[in-house]
Interface confidence: low
């Protein structure tokens, strides 16, 4: 439905508070280096303009597209060239090229200082002094560090952030109340950001059809009682929502997401029996709840898949008439029967089925040719099952920290050219699959583990894309979205890698390590482990374990010493010498 003024339409649909919050998120995700105050000023100017359009949709400039209005506003920033360099060239372009240009300059790893959490009393004072500014600052800081964060979901996080401060700043023990809530929000926020980043990468790097296929599989698992037409409608709408958010169209995205939640709740009888509680919640909670809702029970009387997709004489006819619809139906039918499979496995099966039909429908006897197609699925199903079984056994044997270390060594040997911070971050996250998924029963392990690994490996892909250093990473990241994990799993030690020169400075530690949190201390040790492997890629597990055990003992000893700094200096030299000898450096 055409509106005379798009900005007025969205302002009225979303309300002033959400409008302002979403424009702030959009601007912070585009101009990630701009100070908070500059963004607030721009948002206020846009909001005042939107109000004039609400009052009179025919007023000057009110008929302009949101991209034009927002892009014009961003291009008024005085320091654009100095702060952003070539991004300033975007402003010489016309829409839609200008917006595409801004999108291409989004930085997944912006050079911003780490967010340091102030004392609880300081935070509570700031919250009470100016609640609105405090919450806006939260949106701004998250959005600029996570330029693809799912904007309507960030509003949900901000609501929970506000609730935490409202409750805990009145509590007897503010810190005990607040800190666990903030930790939970931080961890959930990082996970949410990474999941959305994969959705955007799917859309932007592999196209709408790739995202739709993913959505068909996931929604069919979640809503196995819904008919194919219903799932198709939801997939189409969900694709529109995520295309908009990934494209920076945050007002449209939030509006359409609200419409989708409304539709799902109005039609829950034909979608899922698990939606009742979600649909009683307010909008932000409702949308979040629907996105996380558990899988509905599978219908009891589902017939064998073979009848329609192998035994039927019409397989090639149905396939030829509408290939992607037929494959979509195959994916829907397979996925609703297999909540125990990962989405990426389901997509591999669909791809195999498609390849078989492509070959067989051109053969002399098509039916004879594709009759055994389901047998081809067996190795594809067993590969992730075996991998998860082996890794969960290793995790249970080692615990999370040492399991992460095993993965650090494994991945550094596979792709040693990747930067040490990226290897540490990615391997730590890969290692979290153990505590996240291995506790689940067999039927839930694969969807938990392999789909989580897809999210983490996408982090590696987007970070590597910014500064590509490894052809092997590029190959695994770009060749096939659904085969990324098997591609990385299949990589062996990179025999072409020339070991890094030994640099004693890399292994010099100071007393400041003693005051770090356990997590930060682990990261320091894991950074050293990656560097060790880069120096000595042929080192055995036993050699590396011995050096790491010595290192842990050295840190513990020096942190207990009276003169910590001297201990670190003297014992550190000994440790480096002993390690060099042990590893033959």
């Amino acid at each position: 439905d055409a509106h005379k003024s798009e900005v007025a339409h969205r302002f009225k649909d979303l309300g002033e508070e959400n409008f302002k919050a979403l424009v702030l998120i959009a601007f912070a995700q585009y101009l990630q280096q701009c100070p908070f105050e500059d963004h607030v000023k721009l948002v206020n100017e846009v909001t005042e303009f939107a109000k004039t359009c609400v009052a009179d949709e025919s007023a000057e400039n009110c008929d302009k597209s949101l991209h034009t209005l927002f892009g014009d506003k961003l291009c008024t920033v005085a320091t654009l060239r100095e702060t952003y360099g070539e991004m300033a060239d975007c402003c010489a372009k016309q829409e839609p090229e200008r917006n595409e240009c801004f999108l291409q300059h989004k930085d997944d790893n912006p050079n911003l200082p780490r967010l340091v959490r102030p004392e609880v009393d300081v935070m509570c004072t700031a919250f009470h002094d100016n609640e609105e500014t405090f919450l806006k600052k939260y949106l701004y800081e998250i959005a600029r560090r996570h330029p693809y964060f799912y904007a309507p979901e960030l509003l949900f996080f901000a609501k929970r952030y506000k609730a935490a401060f409202t409750e805990c700043c009145q509590a007897a023990d503010k810190a005990a109340c607040l800190l666990p809530k903030l930790d939970e929000l931080r961890d959930e926020g990082k996970a949410s950001s990474a999941k959305q980043r994969l959705k955007c990468a799917s859309l932007q790097k592999f196209g709408e059809r790739a995202f739709k296929a993913w959505a068909v599989a996931r929604l069919s698992q979640r809503f196995p009682k819904a008919e194919f037409a219903e799932v198709s409608k939801l997939v189409t709408d969900l694709t529109k929502v995520h295309t908009e958010c990934c494209h920076g169209d945050l007002l449209e995205c939030a509006d359409d997401r609200a419409d989708l939640a409304k539709y799902i709740c109005e039609n829950q009888d034909s979608i899922s029996s698990k939606l009742k509680e979600c649909c009683e919640k307010p909008l932000l909670e409702k949308s979040h709840c629907i996105a996380e809702v558990e899988n509905d029970e599978m219908p009891a009387d589902l017939p064998s898949l073979a009848a329609d997709f192998v035994e039927s004489k019409d397989v090639c006819k149905n396939y030829a008439e509408a290939k992607d619809v037929f494959l979509g139906m195959f994916l829907y039918e397979y996925a609703r029967r297999h909540p125990d499979y990962s989405v990426v496995l389901l997509l591999r099966l669909a791809k195999t089925y498609e390849t078989t039909l492509e070959k067989c429908c051109a053969a002399a006897d098509p039916h004879e040719c594709y009759a055994k197609v389901f047998d081809e699925f067996k190795p594809l199903v067993e590969e992730p099952q075996n991998l998860i079984k082996q890794n969960c056994e290793l995790f249970e044997q080692l615990g999370e920290y040492k399991f992460q270390n095993a993965l650090l060594v494994r991945y550094t040997k596979k792709v040693p050219q990747v930067s040490t911070p990226t290897l540490v971050e990615v391997s730590r996250n890969l290692g979290k699959v153990g505590s996240k998924c291995c506790k689940h029963p067999e039927a839930k392990r694969m969807p938990c583990a392999e789909d989580y690994l897809s999210v983490v490996l996408n982090q590696l892909c987007v970070l590597h894309e910014k500064t590509p250093v490894s052809d092997r990473v590029t190959k695994c990241c770009t060749e096939s979205l659904v085969n990324r994990r098997p591609c990385f799993s299949a990589l062996e030690v990179d025999e072409t890698y020339v070991p890094k020169e030994f640099n004693a400075e890399t292994f010099t530690f100071h007393a400041d390590i003693c005051t770090l949190s356990e997590k930060e201390r682990q990261i320091k040790k894991q950074t050293a482990l990656v560097e060790l492997v880069k120096h000595k890629p042929k080192a055995t597990k036993e050699q590396l374990k011995a050096v790491m055990d010595d290192f842990a003992a050295f840190v513990e000893k020096c942190c207990k010493a009276d003169d910590k700094e001297t201990c670190f200096a003297e014992e550190g030299k000994k440790l480096v010498a002993a390690s060099q000898a042990a590893l033959g450096l």
Epitope: E100, K205, R209, K323, L481
Partner: nanobody
Framework: HVQLVESGGGLVQAGGSLRLSCAAS????????MGWFRQPPGKEREFVAA????????FYRDSVKGRFTISRDNAKNTVYLQMNSLKSEDTAVYFC????????????????????WGQGTQVTVSS
């Protein structure tokens, strides 16, 4: 979105050669699988050739194999179709098409799976 513009068509004698170009604007072509299709007079549109985005693998319809060559120059944002030993049955409007890598459709020949199309360029081979 990507916009595609074909050029290089024209009238040529049987046995002659033409080189069609397809220039893209709006987005870099390196993200796309590219294909050439054609529509002979009074007939359905048909696949001619395709080239993948990753490894530059090429595919051809049987009747043009050995005569036509598809290539791409990502730096110039252009895809080419070199047509040699042209025959009268090659007469058609030639269309350039681009597709983001779909999860399905490994078959490059399936026109509905291409996302973007040019307006076409006429090739007439006279005998």
């Amino acid at each position: 979105h990507v916009q595609l513009v074909e050029s290089g068509g024209g009238l040529v004698q049987a046995g002659g050669s033409l080189r069609l170009s397809c220039a893209a604007s709006g987005r870099t072509l390196s993200s796309y699988d590219m294909g050439w299709f054609r529509q002979p007079p009074g007939k359905e549109r048909e696949f001619v050739a395709a080239i993948t985005r990753h490894d530059f693998n090429t595919f051809y319809r049987d009747s043009v194999k050995g005569r036509f060559t598809i290539s791409r120059d990502n730096a110039k944002n252009t895809v080419y179709l070199q047509m040699n030993s042209l025959k009268s049955e090659d007469t058609a409007v030639y269309f350039c098409a681009a597709r983001l890598d779909p999860i399905f459709a490994s078959n490059s020949e399936y026109a509905p799976l291409y996302d973007y199309w040019g307006q076409g360029t006429q090739v007439t081979v006279s005998s």
